[in-house]
Amino acid sequence: DNKGYCAQYRGEVCNAVLAKDALVFLNTSYADPEEAQELLVHTAWNELKVVSPVCRPAAEALLCNHIFQECSPGVVPTPIPICREYCLAVKELFCAKEWLVMEEKTHRGLYRSEMHLLSVPECSKLPSMHWDPTACARL
């Protein structure tokens, strides 16, 4: 289980993407969750500079909402995953070509660390909004 806490996003990279005042999940498996997750996004965003103008905004939104998941506050703070349909829209519609390239690089082990893998969600493992409309976060 993820252990962490809910807090308002105070970073810069995802400022324009994440909903204002929304709570995000900060994962305490990192020594400094805010800094680590921000670095994760920052690293991935740098690679997005080369993608198409159609793909980029969709990929940025997916990235930010995946690394800084919406957080449901409670006694046990709970990260809410992105809906599968939004992930698939980015993968198969807006960023089809780029996604193939990225997956190819991943299979060939061209990424230096697991950072990039962490930043890309596996769409098939995400909950569908058709199962339960409240079971996932919409972009």
Partner: antibody
């Protein structure tokens, strides 16, 4: 049927201690976070403390930090509140309350079941 | 701590009236707000969570709305059983806090 029954309340002198208990039945106690909420006579509600199902997460309101300790025994389906250094401001009905997540499993639903409360009176 | 302010403190109404209670938060709590009903000598009862989600078993005449800092609880047609005190509660961040309560009494 979900039941929460508080006990352990009573009259105590300022500076004294008291241990409240809450006996739970009708649900899988070990799967739920639990809470204490109090209400001073004629006043509003005040959240006191919360504990997660496995006791990994524990929270207190500022006014009781260092004086109150929340704990649970899942084997006995029981929630506890150890109250030390009590003052007149702690006089209240203390409610044990359960919470849950909605059917999606993600969205928190606070205080969906309550006990009948136990009265704690701090007076010399 | 986030302060919750309810208005009015007391509300006089008749059976069949549409009643609205307002709850304001001192800072944004997005939708993390609950409403409770309490009758004298009884424990509170959860009515609404996540600002607008109706708790199971609660009559549909109760509804919640709002987001950010301003929220409302509406009783579409007041019934004799609805005369009670109502509390809002934020659970956006610890410490969780309640409003001071709104007493709905018979006019």
């Amino acid at each position: 049927e979900v039941q929460l029954v508080e006990s352990g309340g009573g009259l105590v002198k300022p500076g004294g201690s008291l241990r409240l208990s809450c006996a739970a039945s009708g649900f899988t106690f070990s799967s739920y976070s639990m809470n204490w909420v109090r209400q001073a006579p004629g006043k509003g509600l005040e959240w006191v403390s919360s504990i997660s199902s496995s006791s990994s997460y524990i929270y207190y309101t500022d006014s009781v930090k260092g004086r109150f300790t929340i704990s649970r025994d899942n084997a006995k389906n029981s929630l506890y509140l150890q109250m030390n250094s009590l003052s007149a401001e702690d006089t209240a009905v203390y409610y044990c309350a359960r919470d849950r997540y909605d059917r999606s499993g993600y969205y928190y639903v606070p205080f969906d079941q309550w006990g009948q409360g136990t009265l704690v009176t701090v007076s010399s | 701590d986030i302060q919750m302010t309810q208005s009015p403190s007391t509300l006089s109404a008749s059976v069949g009236d549409r009643v609205t209670i307002t709850c304001r938060a001192s800072q944004s709590i997005t939708s993390w707000l609950a409403w409770y009903q309490q009758k004298p000598g009884k424990a509170p009862k959860l009515l609404i969570y996540k600002a607008s989600s109706l708790e199971s078993g609660v009559p549909s005449r109760f509804s919640g709305s709002g987001s950010g800092t301003e929220f409302t609880l509406t009783i579409s047609s007041l019934q004799p059983d609805d005369f009670a005190t109502y509390y809002c509660q934020q659970y956006n961040s610890f410490s969780w806090t309640f409003g001071q309560g709104t007493k709905v009494e018979i006019k």
